[in-house]
Interface confidence: low
Amino acid sequence: SIPWNLERITPPRYRADEYQPPDGGSLVEVYLLDTSIQSDHREIEGRVMVTDFENVPEEDGTRFHRQASKCDSHGTHLAGVVSGRDAGVAKGASMRSLRVLNCQGKGTVSGTLIGLEFIRKSQLVQPVGPLVVLLPLAGGYSRVLNAACQRLARAGVVLVTAAGNFRDDACLYSPASAPEVITVGATNAQDQPVTLGTLGTNFGRCVDLFAPGEDIIGASSDCSTCFVSQSGTSQAAAHVAGIAAMMLSAEPELTLAELRQRLIHFSAKDVINEAWFPEDQRVLTPNLVAALPPSTHGAGWQLFCRTVWSAHSGPTRMATAVARCAPDEELLSCSSFSRSGKRRGERMEAQGGKLVCRAHNAFGGEGVYAIARCCLLPQANCSVHTAPPAEASMGTRVHCHQQGHVLTGCSSHWEVEDLGTHKPPVLRPRGQPNQCVGHREASIHASCCHAPGLECKVKEHGIPAPQEQVTVACEEGWTLTGCSALPGTSHVLGAYAVDNTCVVRSRDVSTTGSTSEGAVTAVAICCRSRHLAQASQELQGSTSGSGLNDIFEAQKIEWHEHHHHHH
Amino acid sequence: QEDEDGDYEELVLALRSEEDGLAEAPEHGTTATFHRCAKDPWRLPGTYVVVLKEETHLSQSERTARRLQAQAARRGYLTKILHVFHGLLPGFLVKMSGDLLELALKLPHVDYIEEDSSVFAQ
């Protein structure tokens, strides 16, 4: 049988041994910053080049001399997971190893920085194809390490890191907290978050996705043919580095933003049992388990979007929270959420030449989150149209008036501490889909975009009786760009997108009456790009296909029983 | 890595006269900030990453590092420049007493200083 983890990352319709071609990832170079490695291990021999880079602290303790080739253990296993002949994800990827962790698996921020600088200099001296950097390490939050990762990412390098094994918020650790890095948590064969002793995988808004990270069979440094099972978010990150190498090998021109969106898009959704996470982290933690794409063709036409949560604003009255998209992404909508329900909405505003999503706390509130919907929309021209609070009692409205602009999201923001629930909800008059409607005391912000072939439609799901959660989803072929609530009254805790579903949360049913005051409508804006679909069809017609699909029928990899050596 | 403190001490003394005339006040603008790991056992006091403002050139980084050494020497402190960064971030890695942080934060071009800390295999 094939190891569970390789089976898990294979799309359902394919057999893992047929799917993972022997030369997958061959156009990509993966840098591994870790311990020393046993480069003559049969799994990775000839695939991993050990660079002369070494920057490690001295080992602690007096009994160190008795640990010998434990020095190679962590790095060898991870190199095997990324590119191992039998148990690797991207069997064709070539790797370069830098030693930044000592024999006890310990390194320094400064050593890691110098390692990242070494990679950047190597890239400048000898530019190669796509680069993936795997950082299977974590320390406390570090501004400088995050900054270095940001610079390297902006130089076109894909960085993948472990979320950390501390059963804690990944945002408290680096490089896991760096927004430009792809941060990976660990799940097990049951798609549950991995428990490691008394701790386990990190979680929270800084995690991009999860991947297999428990009982992972890979190269053991004990001998050149040994295999061992290891667990941790490092193993999970190694899977994603391998998947990234496969994707980049099939589409070398992918940007970091495109790669991240594809990783999210092709992940298995909603399979993780969220009960394992602390209650306040569940909504922030992505319920995604990484998988290889079924094929690279057919992905190009899709409008890809992801949800980005801000840090918590904190409880002060005027506190705000800001969520930002990556440089190559468009902010198509902005929403907010507060567990206490005390918030003053959200608005899209320009900051440094880019739109950001800002949420506002209210007096007595415990704080808010801003939630940005970040999408890949080439040649988009987006702007925000604002209507101040209405004089009349009909409510505030704003629409996209420019020719060719479509509505992608609605936000509302109010200065009053409590909008009150005494007014009946204002529903959008039919036949005016390009319009945002809100409470008369709120200012309304419409995100209006023009992009070739972009079309959007509004979907609403109203519930007359109070309910803690109202959802509305976009149908197949459409992507959720906007998610908001009508009427935005004080019992609404907020709205946010989960994959292609708009979720509106309200205060506990028991605290709201069952009158019309409890009525809530979830409003989803669903978009698609005819232009992207067309371009993709043209591409498929004009190429003989260099994607993963065309190498599916490549040589089958047998998984021999003796590889279960430590299993 | 062998300790080169002997050689380095001579270098510091040689730098003293060269740098004595330099002004110690930072450039106008925001004050540089100091950061350290929130997890106490992971801190590595005594080694600091001095990060300079974004457009600082390598020569300015080296000059700033030398200036720090000279000013520290004037106060009787030994410092050791372990690495000068360029390519990703401008700055340098310095081994020095924490007593010198206030001085280092006032150096020209300094954006922020971070105390070194541990990272671990996951």
Partner: antibody, heavy 121, light 112 residues
């Protein structure tokens, strides 16, 4: 001081199961792998498998993998080895032995005193 | 599986003698990166648990008298007791840990 104390001798009938315990003291239980080695009367030493107390991960020798189960209870720093479907040739002294450092297959620096298991009808 | 062959299976010697026990493995036990041989020697007295003497083919465990020494590399290894003491009469086992674990069949050292 560091020691491994095993449970007492057992007499079992063929087909039955036996569960031997090994209580560790004087060190951090989860920092060392625990191995089980047996020795039939007048014979040499035979390695059976190990458990990593920190993760619960086990590896069994091919000859035993269908019949042996190794477990641990970290709260009481105890490792267990259960052998099922006992045969008369399972009569042996069973030792637990600690292996320094979690994933290094080097050597066993501390051993239990041994538990005699007799299988007889 | 790696096979370990010890010789002789038994030997008689007197106090003060120099004794050599050899151990051959069916494949090399040398890890090419660490340059360590994954071979250990144990001493076992009747009714007692084995005791570690030597690891990595030649490194003495702390507390082991220096009359015990280990040598060899690759597939051929030797345990030498330079001057036998009364407490040294026991059975000695070699063990490989290069690929899982295998013990040699043992060498019984008896008083002549």
């Amino acid at each position: 001081q560091v020691q491994l104390v095993q449970s007492g001798a057992e007499v079992k009938k063929p087909g039955a199961s036996v569960k031997v315990s090994c209580k560790a003291s004087g060190y951090t239980f989860t920092d060392y792998w625990m191995h089980w080695v047996r020795q039939a009367p007048g014979q040499g030493l035979e390695w059976m498998g190990y458990i990593n107390p920190s993760s619960g991960f086990t590896k069994y020798h091919q000859n035993f993998k269908d019949r042996v189960t190794m477990t641990r209870d970290t709260s009481i720093s105890t490792a267990y080895m259960e052998l099922s479907r006992l045969r008369s040739d399972d009569t042996a002294v069973y030792y637990c032995a600690r292996q320094y450092d979690y994933d290094e297959d080097w050597y066993f620096d501390v051993w239990g005193q041994g538990t005699t298991v007799t299988v007889s009808s | 599986d790696i096979q370990m062959t010890q010789s002789p299976s038994s030997l008689s010697a007197s106090v003060g003698d120099r004794v050599t026990i050899t151990c051959k493995s069916s494949q090399s036990l040398l890890n090419s990166r660490t340059r360590k041989n994954f071979l250990a020697w144990y001493q076992q007295k009747p009714g007692k648990a084995p005791k570690l003497l030597i690891y990595w083919a030649s490194t003495r465990e702390s507390g082991v008298p220096d009359r015990f020494s280990g040598s060899g590399s690759g597939t051929d290894f030797t345990l030498t007791i330079s001057s036998l003491q009364p407490e040294d009469f026991a059975t000695y086992y070699c063990k490989q840990s290069f690929n899982l674990f295998t013990f040699g069949q043992g060498t019984k050292l008896e008083i002549k």
